[in-house]
C-alpha cells in the first residue's frame, strides 16, 4: 500500500508536471496569431484512455514531437526557457510517475489533436489524479 510520504511525493511530482504543461500552454496561448496558426498544424497523438499513472506512457511517447514543435516555433514573441531542459525535466517526472516495472503499449485515440488540445488533455489528467490523491 502507498505510504503517505510516497503519496505526497507523487502529488508534488504531478503538481510540477502540471505547472510545466501549463507554462507551455500559457506561452502558446499568449502567442501572436500567425504563430499559433502554424503551431496548430502540428498534430499530436492523444491517449485513448488516461486515468492511471501508467498511462503517462502515452505522454512520454509524444515528448519528442512536443520538443520539436517548441523548437521550431521558438521566437522573440514565444520564448520558453531552454526547451531541451524543460522537456528533459518533464521526461524525468513522467518516468518516475509511471514507473518502469511494466511497459505499457500505449493505446491512442483514433484522431490526432492540436498542441493546445494535447496539452489541455494532459493538464486535465494531472488535475484529475491530484484530486484523487488529496
Amino acid at each position: 500500500a502507498p505510504t503517505s510520504s510516497s503519496t505526497k511525493k507523487t502529488q508534488l511530482q504531478l503538481e510540477h508536471l502540471l505547472l510545466d504543461l501549463q507554462m507551455i500552454l500559457n506561452g502558446i496561448n499568449n502567442y501572436k496569431n500567425p504563430k499559433l496558426t502554424r503551431m496548430l498544424t502540428f498534430k499530436f497523438y492523444m491517449p485513448k484512455k488516461a486515468t492511471e499513472l501508467r498511462h503517462l506512457q502515452c505522454l512520454e511517447e509524444e515528448l519528442k514531437p512536443l520538443e520539436e514543435v517548441l523548437n521550431l516555433a521558438q521566437s522573440k514573441s514565444f520564448h520558453l526557457r531552454d526547451t531541451k531542459d524543460l522537456i528533459s525535466n518533464i521526461n524525468v517526472i513522467v518516468l518516475e510517475l509511471k514507473g518502469s516495472e511494466t511497459t505499457l503499449m500505449c493505446e491512442y485515440a483514433d484522431e490526432t489533436a492540436t498542441i493546445v488540445e494535447f496539452l489541455n488533455r494532459w493538464i486535465t489528467f494531472c488535475q484529475s489524479i491530484i484530486s484523487t490523491l488529496t
Epitope: 498544424t41 502540428f42 498534430k43 514531437p65 514573441s77 490526432t112 489533436a113
Partner: antibody, heavy 121, light 113 residues
C-alpha cells in the same frame, strides 16, 4: 523505405467522376500531412491542397477549392484526390507529397511517382 | 497569394562550371520574429517526380550533394550549384511556405550547353 505509391494513369471523358489514390508506407502515415500538386502538360507545379490523415484536417488552395475533394483513409494509409465532374482542363500529372508534421515548418520531402489524368471526349 | 518569379526561364550550363538561379517573391518570406526564411528549392529531373533540394532557405535535404546551396533574404533568393554535373539537368522550382496557400515559382530549365 519511405515511399508514396500512386494509382495508375486514367483516361476519362468530360463530365465523368474520378478518384485517384496515394498509399504511404515505411513511416507512420498519421504523423504527416499529405499534399497534392498539379502539373499541367509542359507547365510548372501548382499546390492544390493538403490533408492530415490523423484527423482529416484539410486545407485547399483557393484556386482548387470546390473543384476537387481531398480525403484520406488512415486504416489503409491512403490519401485520395477526387473530381465529381472532370473537364478537359483537368488533364495533368498529379503528384502526392509528404509534407512533414506541419506543412508550414517542413518542405515536401517525399513525392509519389505521379498519376497522369487525361480528359478527352 | 504570394507570387514567386524565377529567372532565367532557361539556363544553358557547362559541366564543371558554377550556375545560379534566381527567385523573387512578391512579399517577404522572412519571419523576423523566428529568424526563419520559408523558401524551398525543388528539382524535377526529366521524366521524374520533383525532389526536395533545399528547405528553409539554406538547409540541404537528406542525400543532396553539397555543391547545392541556397542563399537570400526577404524577397530575393538564389540557388547556387558550385560545379554543375550532367545529372543536375532538369527544371528547378522555388516554393514559399510562409503563407497559405503555398506557391511555386514558374521554374528554371537547366540544360547542358
Amino acid at each position: 523505405e519511405v515511399q508514396l505509391v500512386q494509382s495508375g494513369a486514367e483516361v476519362k471523358k468530360p463530365g465523368e467522376s474520378l478518384k485517384i489514390s496515394c498509399k504511404g508506407s515505411g513511416y507512420r502515415f498519421t504523423s504527416y500531412w499529405i499534399g497534392w500538386v498539379r502539373q499541367m502538360p509542359g507547365k510548372g507545379l501548382e499546390w492544390m491542397g493538403i490533408i492530415h490523415p490523423g484527423d482529416s484536417d484539410t486545407r485547399y488552395s483557393p484556386s482548387f477549392q470546390g473543384q476537387v475533394t481531398i480525403s484520406a483513409d488512415k486504416s489503409i494509409s491512403t490519401a485520395y484526390l477526387q473530381w465529381s465532374s472532370l473537364k478537359a482542363s483537368d488533364t495533368a500529372i498529379y503528384y502526392c507529397t509528404r509534407q512533414g508534421r506541419s506543412f508550414y515548418y517542413y518542405g515536401m520531402d517525399v513525392w509519389g511517382q505521379g498519376t497522369t489524368v487525361t480528359v478527352s471526349s | 497569394d504570394i507570387v514567386m518569379t524565377q529567372t532565367p526561364l532557361s539556363l544553358p550550363v557547362t559541366p564543371g562550371e558554377p550556375a545560379s538561379i534566381s527567385c523573387r517573391s512578391s512579399q517577404s518570406l522572412l519571419d523576423s520574429d523566428e529568424g526563419n526564411t520559408y523558401l524551398d528549392w525543388y528539382l524535377q529531373k526529366p521524366g521524374q517526380s520533383p525532389q526536395l533540394l533545399i528547405y528553409t532557405l539554406s538547409y540541404r535535404a537528406s542525400g543532396v550533394p553539397d555543391r547545392f546551396s541556397g542563399t537570400g533574404s526577404d524577397t530575393d533568393f538564389t540557388l547556387k550549384i558550385s560545379r554543375v554535373e550532367a545529372e543536375d539537368v532538369g527544371v528547378y522550382y522555388c516554393m514559399q511556405r510562409i503563407e497559405f496557400p503555398l506557391t511555386f515559382g514558374g521554374g528554371t530549365k537547366v540544360e547542358i550547353k
